[in-house]
């Protein structure tokens, strides 16, 4: 009679974490008499996974009924597979012996690889806000995947980014892996509504990549532009001066009016108008009683935006005899002289 062969038909199998793995093994003869054992690995350090005759293996069940007299199928099913179960499994036939069974023949082995999905990518931006034209770094992290091969891409508003560095850890063998990537993004004034997206593709995701996003609204600070103008009013001894605060983000803003360097009024921006690009505008006005002033008046609009150092714009009111015209200051720099009604 032909000598018994141990047949493991699958050279390798791949199983998703959490599922069951079926390891196939058949023998070609009922002789010699003796048990089958399953091992993970080979050599003196191999690990017993299942012993037909003794032991308690709660995660292992046999596919066939081993008590049947002519059974030649010694396949096993391992439940609730985790990445730690990866390895090469050998089905080994033992010959009955005394006092111990003697190893008779081994199958060629089945390599079990475990697929584990990456966690949802988490994107984080810089701790402090930055202004347009500055370059900021975003990080993306995803963990717990197996096998190691993975693809990561960065996008800003649908446009793929190229300035990034990615590492998969550990460099050596592991039951599961992590990916860490850092992308550099140049901010523009239009980025309040922009998004940075980290996209991770892995064999376990069946072509449907995972995405993590960060809103640039949490990263960008657009400083305001200031314009101080003088408006005519009906009352001849009053001048209405407005301070237009334009195109700023975020909303947090405090404005102070100064008359000749002395604080006249402080207010916090409340009723803002939002621009299409996500920035805000705000206007504050100051009614100046010109008759109360003998000399020219320097009016300063001072704005503190998002805790940053104050920026200001000044406007000079010329206190002169019965002017007929009014002017406005629309240019930065030293205040322009403007006629004001007395």
């Amino acid at each position: 009679e032909e000598e018994l062969q141990v047949i493991q038909p699958d050279k390798s199998i791949s199983v998703a974490a959490g599922e069951s793995a079926t390891l196939h093994c058949t023998v070609t003869s009922l002789i010699p008499v003796g048990p089958i054992q399953w091992f993970r690995g080979a050599g003196p350090g191999r690990e017993l996974i299942y012993n037909q005759k003794e032991g308690h293996f709660p995660r292992v069940t046999t596919v066939s009924d081993l008590t049947k007299r002519n059974n030649m199928d010694f396949s096993i099913r391992i439940s609730n597979i985790t990445p730690a179960d990866a390895g090469t499994y050998y089905c080994v036939k033992f010959r009955k012996g005394s006092p111990d069974h003697v190893e008779f023949k081994s199958g060629a082995g089945t390599e079990l690889s475990v697929r584990a999905k990456p966690s949802a990518p988490v994107v984080s931006g810089p701790a402090a806000r930055a202004t347009p034209q500055h370059t900021v770094s975003f990080t993306c992290e995803s963990h717990g995947f197996s096998p190691r091969d993975i693809t990561l891409k960065w996008f800003k508003n649908g446009n793929e980014l190229s300035d990034f560095q990615t590492n998969v850890d550990p460099a050596g063998d592991s039951v599961s892996y992590s990916i860490h990537s850092t992308a550099k993004v140049v901010l523009t004034r239009e980025d309040v509504h922009s998004q940075v997206i980290c996209e991770v593709a892995h064999v376990t995701l069946q072509g449907d990549p995972l995405r993590g996003t960060a809103n640039l609204s949490e990263t960008i600070r657009v400083p305001p532009t200031l314009e101080v103008t003088q408006q005519p009013v009906r009352a001849e001894n009053q001048v209405n001066v407005t301070c237009q605060v334009r195109k700023f983000y975020p909303q947090r803003l405090q404005l102070t009016w100064l008359e000749n360097g002395n604080v006249s009024r402080t207010e916090t921006a409340s009723t803002l108008t939002e621009n299409k690009d996500g920035t805000y505008n705000w206007m504050s006005w100051l009614l100046v009683n010109v008759s109360a002033h003998r000399d020219d008046v320097k009016l300063t609009c001072q704005v503190e935006h998002d805790g940053q150092p104050a920026v200001s714009k000044s406007h000079d009111l010329k206190v002169s005899a019965h002017p007929k015209e009014q002017g406005s200051n629309t240019a930065p720099g030293p205040a322009l002289a403007s006629a004001a009604p007395l």
Epitope: A42, G43, G87, T88, E103, K105, S106, D173
Partner: antibody
């Protein structure tokens, strides 16, 4: 292909601890045994011990009390620590990969590092 | 421990001629599965050992076919069909059936 590179001090004082690291590049730690073998000057090969990828260790009985082999799969490295060294531990130390295909035995030490000379002297 | 004994310890050879080295183990290296856990290594001068033969008779990858291994149980032979100048060095047999792994004392092959 797989390459092994030993690193560590070339000179160790008597009674101190010898520490060597072997870095595995170009291949996987899994399914292999990772061995340390030494060769005293002008003599033959002496097996010190090995570690399997699952962390199980095996040592030369005469060295067992002084030797620890450990594995860091995340760095693709394994290490040898030998305490209380004497002049008799002066040797070229090799790290090597041992294959295991099936069964209880092993299938040859198929990849060797270039060896690092360790001298025990005060 | 399994003791490995080689002979001869020194072997002068002539290039182009055959050569043979013997190795004996203190217990059988033929396992119950029919596999022989005996390996042969060559250590060229100033180099690390390299695996020539494993499993008693299987040539390792890249090893020229002039090297062959034979034997079973406790007696083994390494044959070089036609010695070449690059074959000089020390040949070791080693057993891989059980720990500790053990090696023969080595056979030094040199050109006459």
């Amino acid at each position: 292909q797989v390459q092994l590179q030993e690193s560590g001090p070339g000179l160790v004082k008597p009674s101190e601890t010898l520490s060597l690291t072997c870095t595995v590049s170009g291949g996987s730690i899994r399914d292999y045994y990772w061995s340390w073998i030494r060769q005293p000057p002008g003599k033959g090969l002496e097996w010190i011990g090995f570690i399997y990828y699952n962390g199980r260790t095996f040592y030369q009985s005469s060295l067992k009390s002084r030797v620890t082999i450990s594995l860091d799969t995340s760095k693709n490295q394994f290490s040898l620590k030998m305490t209380s060294v004497t002049a008799a531990d002066t040797a070229v130390y090799y790290c090597a990969r041992v294959r295991a295909y099936s069964g209880i035995g092993l299938d040859g030490t198929d990849v060797w590092g270039q060896g690092t000379t360790v001298t025990v002297s005060s | 421990d399994i003791v490995m004994t080689q002979s001869p310890l020194s072997l002068p050879v002539t290039p182009g001629e055959p050569a043979s080295i013997s190795c004996r183990s203190s217990q059988s290296l033929l396992y119950s599965t029919g596999y022989t856990y005996l390996d042969w290594y060559l250590q060229r001068p100033g180099q690390s050992p390299q695996l020539l033969i494993y499993g008693g008779s299987s040539r390792a990858s890249g090893v020229p076919d002039r090297f062959s291994g034979s034997g079973s149980g406790t007696d083994f032979t390494l044959k070089i069909s036609r010695v070449e100048a690059e074959d000089v060095g020390v040949f070791y047999c080693g057993q891989a059936l059980q720990t500790p792994l053990t090696f023969g004392q080595g056979t030094k092959v040199e050109i006459k």
